[in-house]
């Protein structure tokens, strides 16, 4: 049966915790994304930026969760509106914004 | 350390308005909510709202409705409350309090764990 | 609005009593995640309020083992196990799983 959204959403939260907790050198090497506005449409847009970083173990895990969340199929070089224009930030800022922005969906109880 | 420091004591007339700020330090309020709660002399606590400082969401008591608007300022780490219309039942303290999440944690409280001194707010013709 | 009832509305007691305060809502407060947030807060004369409790029973950082938290539903408690003279003051029930978030009217421990 299919897990319902909190599972879901907790699930990805656990693991954005995990990659936080365990981060001994610079996640992904120092790799930098894409910023998004953390907004309608989140886990597509977060997706979005991830998938063009390659070869990072850390983040495969986050990258196949999020591909669940969004409804569309994304690949690498794609990106919505959702973009902030031309600003790129470390792979472990985007990960920290992204977990302070998923725990309050979840405390206020919005899960799709 | 964590700190929230809030404006100085007010005395507005029936009518009037006033915004009480809070000012804080130590954390990123973009990470929290900030919220007020009031407290009438000799009363209980009364929650009157709360802000999401990273997109400017409030949620407001019914009662408050209209009547009040929490702002956050994220450039100057500042929250406020306005409150219009004041009358007499308004004179109380005036508390602003964060609640924020824990990196090393999924569940997390989002208690209102630190609070300003509290601003007195008096409310006499 | 949910209603929050603590009783008793004032309470005195002697330094090493066991103490409780219950605190009843007006309906079930299990927020939608799951979790219920039921909150118990510390107030002296001209202080700010202080966390103890959150989520009906996990002790805030710092605060003495002496104070605990219990309780489900609509029904909670908190428990002071052997009363030292810094704990007479005012203690408020708390819930925040449904907007409006609501106060108990608070409950007065005074020396006997």
């Known amino acids: 049966s299919p897990v319902p959204p909190s599972t879901a959403l907790k699930e990805l939260i656990e693991e954005l915790v995990n990659i936080t907790q365990n981060q001994k050198a610079p996640l992904c090497n120092g790799s930098m994304v894409w910023s998004i506005n953390l907004t309608a449409g989140v886990y597509c847009a977060a997706l979005e930026s991830l998938i063009n970083v390659s070869g990072c173990s850390a983040i495969e895990k986050t990258q196949r969760m999020l591909n669940g969340f969004c409804p569309h199929k994304v690949s690498a070089g794609q990106f919505s509106s959702l973009r902030v224009r031309d600003t790129k930030i470390e792979v472990a800022q985007f990960v920290k914004d992204l977990l302070v922005h998923l725990k309050k969906l979840f405390r206020e109880g919005q899960f799709n | 350390q964590v700190q929230l420091v809030q404006s100085g004591a007010e005395v507005k007339k029936p009518g009037s308005s006033v915004k009480v700020s809070c000012k804080a330090s130590?954390?990123?309020?973009?990470?929290?909510?900030m919220h007020w709660v009031r407290q009438a002399p000799g009363q209980g606590l009364e929650w009157m709202g709360t802000?999401?400082?990273?997109?400017?969401?409030?949620k407001y008591v019914p009662k408050f409705q209209g009547r009040v608007t929490i702002t956050a300022d994220e450039s100057t780490s500042t929250a406020y409350m306005e409150l219009s219309s004041l009358r007499s039942e308004d004179t109380a303290v005036y508390y602003c309090a964060r609640s924020i999440y824990d990196d090393y944690h999924v569940d997390d409280y989002y208690a209102m764990d630190y609070w300003g001194q509290g601003t007195l707010v008096t409310v006499s013709s | 609005d949910i209603q929050m009832t603590q009783s008793p509305s004032s309470l005195s007691a002697s330094v090493g009593d066991r103490v409780t305060i219950t605190c009843r809502s007006s309906?079930?407060?299990?927020?939608?995640?799951?979790?219920?947030?039921l909150e118990w807060y510390q107030q002296k004369p001209g202080k700010a309020p202080k966390l103890l409790i959150y989520?009906?029973?996990d002790r805030f950082s710092g605060v003495p083992s002496r104070f605990s938290g219990s309780g489900s539903g609509t029904d909670f408690t908190l428990t002071i196990s052997s009363l030292q003279p810094e704990d007479f003051a005012t203690y408020y029930c708390f819930q925040g799983s449904h907007v409006p978030w609501t106060f108990g009217q608070g409950t007065k421990l005074e020396i006997k």
């Open positions: 130590g954390f990123y309020i973009k990470d929290t909510y």
């Open positions: 802000i999401d400082p990273a997109n400017g969401n409030t």
């Open positions: 989520k009906i029973s």
């Open positions: 309906q079930n407060i299990v927020h939608i995640n799951g979790n219920t947030y």
